[in-house]
């Protein structure tokens, strides 16, 4: 079964996927596609990297992390209900049938209509329903709470800060990370 991630309409969704390059700059081709991972590559490719760079992308889909260090997590900008579904992250490790593939399920919820809260910089308050499990199993659900009073730039900043915080560590420990070499 796919690991499930959640976001609300209008937010940016974050789908984690990591690998550890065998050596700095020794990159592995990666593709992201809408739909479960097929037999080869990705179906409905939305973003692709090669051994050097991102070589294909479509609007609203980007890598916010440092893909040169193996953070190939996908950000989907300003999601709509149509963005719901399964996404494939495929890490095309060189060799004979070495691919690693991850199916991640994105659930988009309608935006909540709530009174504008007091601005919060505290991560727990800003992201009230973000759940991650530590240690053993995968992060079953990642939910970005509604942020009616924070603009996209602030969301992006928070996401960047989060990525450098405990969440990134939890996700890297969640089984969606592979080590090469």
């Amino acid at each position: 079964s796919e690991v499930e991630y959640r976001a609300e309409v209008g937010q940016n969704a974050y789908l984690p996927c990591f690998y550890t390059p065998a050596a700095p700059g020794n990159l592995v081709p990666v593709c992201w596609g809408k739909g479960a991972c097929p037999v080869f590559e990705c179906g409905n490719v939305v973003l692709r990297t090669d051994e050097r760079d991102v070589n294909y992308w479509t609007s609203r889909y980007w890598l916010n992390g440092d893909f040169r260090k193996g953070d190939v997590s996908l950000t989907i900008e300003n999601v709509t209900l149509a963005d719901s579904g399964i996404y494939c992250c495929r890490i095309q490790i060189p060799g004979i049938m070495n691919d690693e593939k991850f199916n991640l399920k994105l659930v988009i919820k309608p935006a909540k209509v709530t009174p504008a809260p007091t601005r919060q910089r505290d991560f727990t308050a800003a992201f009230p329903r973000m759940l991650t499990t530590r240690g053993h199993g995968p992060a079953e659900t990642q939910t970005l709470g509604s942020l009616p009073d924070i603009n996209l730039t602030q969301i992006s900043t928070l996401a960047n800060e989060l990525r450098d915080s405990r969440l990134a560590n939890d996700l890297r420990d969640s089984g969606a990370t592979i080590r090469i070499g």
Partner: antibody, heavy 117, light 107 residues
Framework: EVQLLESGGGLVQPGGSLRLSCAAS????????MSWVRQAPGKGLEWVSA????????YYADSVKGRFTISRDNSKNTLYLQMNSLRAEDTAVYYC??????????WGQGTLVTVSS | DIVMTQSPSSLSASVGDGVTITCQAS??????LNWYQQKPGKAPKLLIY???SLQSGVPSRFSGSGSGTDFTLTISSLQPEDFATYYC?????????FGQGTKLEIK
């Protein structure tokens, strides 16, 4: 014109070797996964092998693993299949095929490989 | 390996008839199902990809449907050039596998 053209087939004895080639034209060869699919006389289609666009990742059917090697030369727009330790059951028409949108969307005309003593 | 079972193995029909060929996968393959047409002595030709998407240049009388394990190829009004063998193929799980084929003959 977008096309694939196989060559290299022929008659070979059991245990022998053969190298098939597939020349691609009319598209950006290095951007596509490529495959070999075979068809024994009067039989159905059987996937044999595939290779990623860069050539770094390769895939084989169990029936040929360890005997066949797929490779490509993107500078020459050419796909190869090196076939060693050939058996009678490898007798077939071998097609090269482009893989796109999760399907084999472009096929060559095929080259016949006959393994017989 | 996923087993693809086509039915019927052969059928006879007349020009202008509508025909349906079915393909069943031994396990869920989402919509990763393709249909090919092959004429004697020729290479296969892609007709339908992703269960229902018509390949460029293929006449609209060909259509595909289904998801999960059960799929169909429909030819709405047979033309003389449609008499051939048809194969389904799954692209969900390794290795890719084909059905055994359905031979469509003129009645």
């Amino acid at each position: 014109e977008v096309q694939l053209l196989e060559s290299g087939g022929g008659l070979v004895q059991p245990g022998g070797s053969l190298r098939l080639s597939c020349a691609a034209s009319g598209f950006t060869f290095s951007s596509y996964y490529m495959s070999w699919v075979r068809q024994a006389p009067g039989k159905g289609l059987e996937w044999v092998s595939a290779i990623s666009g860069s050539g770094g990742s390769t895939y084989y059917a169990d029936s040929v693993k360890g005997r066949f090697t797929i490779s490509r030369d993107n500078s020459k727009n050419t796909l190869y299949l090196q076939m060693n330790s050939l058996r009678a059951e490898d007798t077939a028409v071998y097609y090269c095929a482009r893989y796109a949108r999760t399907a084999f969307d472009l096929w060559g005309q095929g080259t016949l490989v006959t393994v017989s003593s | 390996d996923i087993v693809m079972t086509q039915s019927p193995s052969s059928l006879s029909a007349s020009v202008g008839d509508g025909v349906t060929i079915t393909c069943q996968a031994s396990q869920d393959i989402y919509n990763y199902l393709n249909w090919y047409q092959q004429k004697p002595g020729k290479a296969p030709k892609l007709l339908i990809y992703a269960a229902s998407s018509l390949q460029s240049g293929v006449p609209s009388r060909f259509s595909g449907s289904g998801s999960g394990t059960d799929f169909t190829l429909t030819i709405s009004s047979l033309q003389p050039e449609d008499f051939a063998t048809y194969y389904c193929q799954q692209a969900n799980s390794f290795p890719p596998t084909f059905g055994q084929g359905t031979k469509l003959e003129i009645k």
